[in-house]
């Protein structure tokens, strides 16, 4: 029998390489049974996760999973950093793993970085 606990399926130590000026949707995959939980996004500032207020969010429904989406319209350089979603479920808070947005500011780059440049930058981000 499947558990009816809420699960937030953000992969541990996942990341997204994105460009400033582009639109981007950050998805939090949510598994629940009867009642859809209240889900919020926050951005990590050191060890504190600061709740994101007044941002454009939406839900997307797929067969076995729902997605709580944080919209970046467009991505700004200041959106660089780590994000986490959390759900209120039976008066408990379930937190996801954090996922990191690595934002390249195209204004400061003469061209989009190569695979090797991106790899070395991401290496610094995770080391």
């Amino acid at each position: 029998k499947e558990s009816c606990d809420v699960q937030l399926y953000i992969k541990r130590q996942s990341y997204h390489s994105i460009f400033a000026g582009d639109p981007f949707k950050l998805e939090c995959p949510v598994k629940y049974c009867a009642h859809r939980p209240q889900v919020t996004w926050c951005k990590l500032n050191g060890t504190t996760c600061v709740k994101l207020e007044g941002r454009h969010t939406s839900w997307k429904q797929e067969k076995n999973l729902s997605f709580f989406i944080l919209h970046f319209e467009p991505v700004l350089p200041s959106d660089n950093g780590s994000y986490r979603c959390s759900a209120n479920f039976l008066s408990a808070i379930i937190e996801s793993h954090s996922t990191t947005l690595y934002v390249t500011d195209v204004k400061s780059a003469s061209e989009r970085p190569s695979k090797d440049e991106m790899a070395s930058r991401l290496w610094l981000l995770y080391s």
Partner: antibody, heavy 120, light 112 residues
Framework: EVQLQQSGAELVKPGASVELSCTAS????????IYWVKQRPEQGLQWIGR????????KYDPRFQDKATLTAEISSNTAHLQLNSLTSEDTAVYFC?????????????WGQGTSVTVSS | AVVMTQTPLTLSVTIGQPASISCKSS???????????LIWLLQRPGQSPMRLIY???KLDSGVPDRFTGSGSGTDFTLKISRVEAEDLGIYYC?????????FGGGTKLEIK
């Protein structure tokens, strides 16, 4: 039942490239990570890197950054490891490994391995 | 990179006797989420490795309870309470906290 079926043994010439495949059954690769691990004859295990098949994002051990390229196709539930500029040092068995279940994502199921022999 | 040091290199044990393998990491393996991503693997002769233990001490399904994992921070131990013939092979520890992921050098368990 979870299974990782790897492609057959390869005999390749120095300087050439080779692509190995790993086809998953019993789970969707997009829901986890796929790791690749190298084992030289009579030696230990070396982590090459990982791919997130959901978005194609990769992480490599710096030692393999210029040697290996990881890709994945969700449609066929298959991951690939390409090795380039092969030398005798690349003669080894290469394993694909499932990156584990939510929430821990630590390697659990292993493929049977693909033997690569580099020889002229 | 995090260096994983396993001792001993080889362990020769009589069937029915206990065995203990040590794995020390050069950095703390406690992750920011409060979990310690240390696993133990066994590679039997001619086979792929198989996971025995994850998160330091959690036993995989189907793994006999004569195997126990313990430790924290940088010091970890795999113990077999009573060695059986099917336990022979090479044991590896692996850390999944830091990039790049790294393995210990392996400990060969031989049956006396």
């Amino acid at each position: 039942e979870v299974q990782l079926q790897q492609s057959g043994a390869e005999l390749v010439k120095p300087g050439a490239s080779v692509e190995l495949s790993c086809t998953a059954s019993g789970f969707n690769i997009k829901d986890t990570y796929i790791y690749w691990v190298k084992q030289r004859p009579e030696q230990g295990l070396q982590w090459i890197g990982r791919i997130d098949p959901a978005n194609g994002h990769t992480k490599y051990d710096p030692r393999f950054q210029d040697k290996a390229t990881l890709t994945a196709e969700i449609s066929s539930n298959t991951a690939h490891l390409q090795l380039n500029s092969l030398t005798s040092e690349d003669t080894a068995v290469y394993f694909c490994v499932r990156g584990g279940d939510h929430p821990y994502y630590v390697m659990d199921w292993w493929g049977q391995g693909t033997s690569v022999t580099v020889s002229s | 990179a995090v260096v994983m040091t396993q001792t001993p290199l080889t362990l020769s044990v009589t069937i029915g006797q206990p065995a203990s393998i040590s794995c020390k990491s050069s950095q703390n393996l406690l992750d920011s989420d409060g979990k310690t991503y240390l696993i133990w693997l066994l590679q039997r002769p001619g086979q792929s490795p198989m996971r025995l233990i994850y998160l330091v001490s959690k036993l995989d399904s189907g793994v006999p309870d004569r195997f126990t994992g313990s430790g924290s921070g940088t010091d970890f131990t795999l113990k077999i309470s009573r060695v059986e013939a099917e336990d022979l092979g090479i044991y590896y520890c692996w850390q999944g906290t830091h990039f790049p992921r790294t393995f210990g050098g392996g400990t060969k368990l031989e049956i006396k």
